[in-house]
């Protein structure tokens, strides 16, 4: 019962985590304009992995996709790749874990096969979670570096008295969603790996049956036939991992001239 609960909970936690990784990957708020100690503007900038957006105080929001692959920073490409790998592994892990669930009967699938699948999905969830955490952390590190670089030369002279204010970016909501989601997927994966150990059939020994020819009474002693399942008690659990992706076209949400925000 505890094994089923652990497996089920691991599945649910991973499912929530992967949904979060997908959401984070799709979100536009990976980095948002820093409003602290900055000349306040009537325009708010924020950026995602796939597009950058501008929201005016009028309510008009305009998003432009990054319609280039080669022109993008290598770090951004790396983050995209990590998130995509995380989502793909997570999705496969979910698919495998559905069939591995103890509460679901599929034909005459043995417990040993379910245990194998549970371990596989657990490893996939772990790798998926690690990918997401790594992707978000790389992006966060990139932001911190750029933040302090732009702070150092916040006001750059543009010839004479004219000044241009550099926009600084700070952590967006997607980073926190990604960290939490990656953590949940990781925890879910660990739970699946733990459940896998409980699913592996116990070793049972059948001692030899002894027949006494002299007497009429036959003594039968059950004993220890060793079941070979491929999951011995000393079998080590392995681990795996996932990420996410998505592209978006340029989107513009226009406020009607007669519809103020």
């Amino acid at each position: 019962m505890a094994v089923t609960a652990c497996q089920g909970l691991g599945f649910v936690v991973s499912l929530i985590g992967i949904a979060g990784i997908i959401a984070a990957t799709c979100m536009d708020q990976w980095s948002t304009q820093d409003l602290y100690n900055n000349p306040v503007t009537a325009v708010f900038n924020y950026q995602g992995l796939w597009r950058s957006c501008v929201r005016e105080s009028s309510g008009f929001t305009e998003c432009r996709g990054y319609f280039t692959l080669l022109g993008l920073p290598a770090m951004l490409q790396a983050v995209r790749a990590l998130m995509i790998v995380g989502i793909v592994l997570g999705a496969i892990g979910l698919l495998v874990s559905i069939f591995a669930l103890k509460c679901i009967r599929i034909g005459s699938m043995e417990d040993s096969a379910k245990a194998n699948m549970t371990l596989t999905s657990g490893i996939m969830f772990i790798v998926s979670g690690l990918c997401a955490i790594a992707g978000v952390s790389v992006f966060a590190n990139m932001l911190v570096t750029n933040f302090w670089m732009s702070t150092a030369n916040m006001y750059t002279g543009m010839g004479g008295m004219v000044q241009t204010v550099q926009t600084r970016y700070t952590f967006g909501a997607a980073l926190f969603v990604g960290w939490v989601a990656g953590g949940l997927t990781l925890i879910g994966g660990v739970m699946m790996c733990i459940a896998c150990r409980g699913l592996a059939p116990e070793e049972t020994n059948y001692k030899a049956v002894s027949y006494h020819a002299s007497g009429h009474s036959v003594a039968y002693k059950p004993g220890g036939f060793k079941a070979s399942t491929g999951f011995g008690s000393n079998t080590k659990n392995k681990k795996i991992y996932d990420g996410g992706a998505r592209t978006e076209d340029e989107v513009q949400s226009y406020p009607s001239k007669h519809d103020y925000v």
Epitope: T41, A42, S58, V261
Partner: antibody, heavy 117, light 113 residues
């Protein structure tokens, strides 16, 4: 069509307060409404703005201590109260609705406030 | 605060003439996020509220005659009237719509000779 209708002209004494209104009609009352002052023969000066959705407001530091922007959603009306009036506050006060590029597409007809003893 | 400087203060032109009004800001009004300049032009006739002509430095408001055009980027902007008509006599204001407080230029008064 979109209309911003302002209250009538006011004559007030120095040190007193005045509360001007700006009633919006012909559109969804959700966008920032701005207030602008124009002294006789002078240019335009931004006073502040209020968001009818959440009543959040931003003010020009120059007017912050003396100006209060409020609203009544039930009547789609924005109010601007200016206190401690001085003779240099004699001007036409406009309310304006925001549009693309944070520009002001719709303007009230203006309210002339005369500060005189 | 951002200082908006308009030039000239006033000018008198003949009907049909081409006229250029200038506006300079003390800081760049270009937003890197969408590559748009947050500068607006208004026309104000005596006894009337201002009327929106151009936003985003070059986008003409619907209903505004096409003889009005805006250009410029960063800190230097111009409003051009390709062929001045009698009804164009007014004061023209430029506005910073990017930084708070939103600021206006002193205005340029256009008259007919």
């Amino acid at each position: 069509q979109v209309q911003l209708v302002q209250s009538g002209a006011e004559v007030v004494k120095p040190g007193a307060s005045v509360k001007l209104s700006c009633k919006a009609s012909g559109y969804t009352f959700t966008n920032w409404v701005h207030w602008v002052i124009q002294a006789p023969g002078q240019g335009l000066e931004w006073i502040g703005e209020i968001n009818p959705t959440n009543a959040r407001s931003n003010y020009n530091e120059k007017f912050k201590k003396r100006v209060t922007l409020t609203l009544d959603r039930s009547t789609s009306t924005v109010y601007m109260e200016l206190s401690s009036l001085r003779s240099e506050d004699t001007a036409v006060y406009f309310c304006a609705g925001i549009y693309y590029g944070n520009s002001f597409a719709h303007w009230g007809q203006g309210t002339l406030v005369t500060v005189s003893s | 605060d951002i200082v908006m400087t308009q030039s000239p203060d006033s000018l008198a032109v003949s009907l049909g003439e081409r006229v250029t009004l200038n506006c300079k800001s003390s800081q760049s009004l270009l937003n890197a996020g969408n590559q748009k300049n947050y500068l607006t032009w208004y026309q104000q006739k005596p006894g009337q509220p201002p009327k929106l002509l151009i936003y985003w430095s070059s986008t003409r408001e619907s209903g505004v005659p096409d003889r009005f055009s805006g250009s410029g980027s960063g800190t230097d902007f111009t409003l051009t009237i390709s062929s001045v008509q009698a009804e164009d006599v007014a004061v023209y204001h430029c506005q910073n719509n990017y930084y708070y407080p939103l600021t206006f230029g002193g205005g340029t008064k256009l008259e007919i000779k």
